[in-house]
């Protein structure tokens, strides 16, 4: 509408008793320069006088400024486009409507701006993203609908009452569109932050507390687990029993399923928090963990390495190398599965015990024809002695001896 003056400013400004208010404002008059400006508080139009009644906070005419009792009110504008105002300090009873009465040579206009002054500093507002997941960086925002050049403030972040180490970025806006102070904090929450209280604290320039807002963090995370095993060292003998228990320390959202894994593979029909292994066999040795899932995903406990100890199994002998040429060297290796590893070996040549040979390997540096035959061994550990296996045959090759002619 070309018959209107054009104004731009925030619709409502907020402050508190003793602070100040800065009102960014621009305008465009219908014709020529501004000749008279009056700032009213709660103006009301009087039909009888065709004038506005109300408290005059500020007045200026083409003849110059009228000395105002209210030195706290300043018109920082000009005669054709700036109508910025400042009230410092601002008082509770300044709340209400501010009326900017503008007069040019031929035109008049009343522009209204709302002012909301509270008794005490009002709290900022913390804004969180709709969902927070563990280890994913989020931005926490603290917004206060206040900023004023004459009243410096600061916003501080606290986690469970302790200042947060992360650097926050504070920005202010004092424009015709918006007036605010904002602090943004980048933060990578861990699962342990779930349920913790984050505070944004409004402070004055000296760090004195003015107000705050608090939120409780809702950090989505996979189930966090602890595993316990009995016996605690997870070392048992064949035939013993083992119990593993899994405890969920925290899950958000609720956990739904439980399973047990052995060497990374799921154990069938094991869907409770207790895993009972009765009369264990050696092939149940391995790495065990529990897995509990929620909507975020599966959580796994640490691995428990179960060692099932057993006496040595029947031994086999490996010969390096057979057949062997007379004078060459040969090595025999006794192989037997056992846990713990065998500590003692007994060697046999053609069924007869080889004296002084108690190691896993037997080394013969110079093979003679009489070394040929069957070699076998027996392994022994703390749980017992294994059985003698079938043995291995050493074939010794040699040149003709004691040649006789017939």
């Amino acid at each position: 509408d070309s018959s209107k003056w054009v104004f731009e400013h925030p619709e409502t400004l907020y402050a508190w008793e003793g602070a100040c208010v800065w009102i960014p404002c621009t305008y465009r008059a219908l014709d020529g320069d501004l000749e008279s400006f009056i700032l009213f508080h709660n103006p009301e139009y009087n039909k009888n006088t065709s004038k506005f009644d109300g408290t005059r906070l500020y007045e200026s005419t083409k003849d110059g400024k009228v000395p105002s009792e209210q030195k706290r009110v300043q018109f920082l504008g000009d005669k054709n486009k700036n109508c910025t105002l400042s009230i410092h300090p601002v008082h509770l009873n300044d709340s209400g409507q501010l009326g900017l009465r503008m007069e040019s040579k031929t035109e008049k206009w009343m522009e209204r701006i709302h002012l909301n002054v509270s008794e005490r500093p009002f709290p900022p507002h913390i804004q969180l993203p709709p969902e927070i997941q563990e280890s994913q960086e989020v931005t926490l925002t603290c917004l206060l609908n206040f900023s004023c050049y004459g009243y410096p403030i600061q916003l501080q972040w606290l986690l469970e009452g302790v200042p947060m180490r992360q650097a926050a970025v504070t920005s202010t806006s004092l424009t015709i569109k918006s007036v605010f102070t904002r602090s943004e904090l980048k933060f990578s929450p861990q699962w342990s932050h779930h349920g913790k209280i984050v505070t944004c604290q409004l402070q004055d320039a000296d760090g004195k507390f003015l107000s705050n807002d608090t939120v409780q963090l809702n950090v989505k995370h996979t189930p966090k687990l602890e595993i316990k095993v009995t016996p605690s060292d997870a070392i048992v003998r064949e035939g013993d029993s083992v119990t593993m228990t899994c405890e969920v320390s925290s899950s958000n959202p609720e956990y739904t399923t439980v399973s047990w894994l052995k060497d990374g593979t799921s154990l069938k029909k094991q869907n409770t928090f207790t895993l009972n292994l009765r009369e264990v066999t050696k092939d149940q040795s391995g790495k065990y963990c529990c897995q509990v899932s929620n909507d975020v995903g599966p959580g796994r406990s640490e691995e428990v390495f179960l060692q099932v100890q057993y006496a040595p199994e029947p031994s086999t002998v490996q010969i390096l190398h057979s057949p062997a040429v007379e004078g060459s060297q040969v090595e025999f290796l006794c192989m037997s599965l056992a846990n713990p590893l065998p500590t003692n070996y007994t060697w046999y040549h053609n069924g007869k015990e080889m004296q002084g040979r108690t190691e896993e390997k037997v080394h013969i540096p110079k093979i003679l024809p009489w070394h040929a035959g069957t070699y076998s061994c027996v392994a022994e550990n703390i749980l017992g002695t294994g059985q003698r296996g079938p043995g291995a045959e050493l074939d010794v090759q040699y040149p003709p001896k004691k040649v006789t002619t017939v």
């Epitope: 966090k224 405890e247 959202p253 956990y255």
Partner: nanobody
């Protein structure tokens, strides 16, 4: 839907004992952390005790420690609260609840998703 039903409440003399039971419908009871809470007339709901699914983690409120014992039988989908040396202050409606969020939240009522109707325990002097 998991349903919980308490029983075992009643009137008992101060110094006496009671054993409360809570039976759950469905297999999920065996994987739930189970807790007992109580509410006396005109007072807020108060945490009493909780037990983890395996029974390996047990917590009690300071007011019942040493007098009450929580236990469970997963095969029967049942949780028990053995209450000894009962006092007048123990008078309340006792409610059992199921939690699928872990033992760190065992005393936080808001983390329990399923609740029973409760059983009245009255301790007279």
């Amino acid at each position: 839907q998991l349903q919980l039903v308490e029983s075992g409440g009643g009137l008992v003399q101060a110094g006496g004992s009671l054993r409360l039971s809570c039976v759950g419908s469905g297999d999920r009871v065996s994987i739930a952390l189970m807790g007992w809470f109580r509410q006396a007339p005109g007072k807020e709901r108060e945490f009493v005790a909780a037990i983890s699914p395996s029974g390996g983690r047990i917590t009690y409120s300071d007011s019942v420690k040493g007098r009450f014992t929580i236990s469970r039988d997963n095969a029967k989908n049942t949780v028990y609260l053995q209450m000894n040396s009962l006092k007048r202050d123990d008078t309340a409606v006792y409610v059992c609840a199921a939690n699928f969020r872990g033992y760190l939240s065992s005393s936080r009522g808001s983390d329990y998703a399923y609740w029973g109707q409760g059983t009245q325990v009255t301790v007279s002097s």
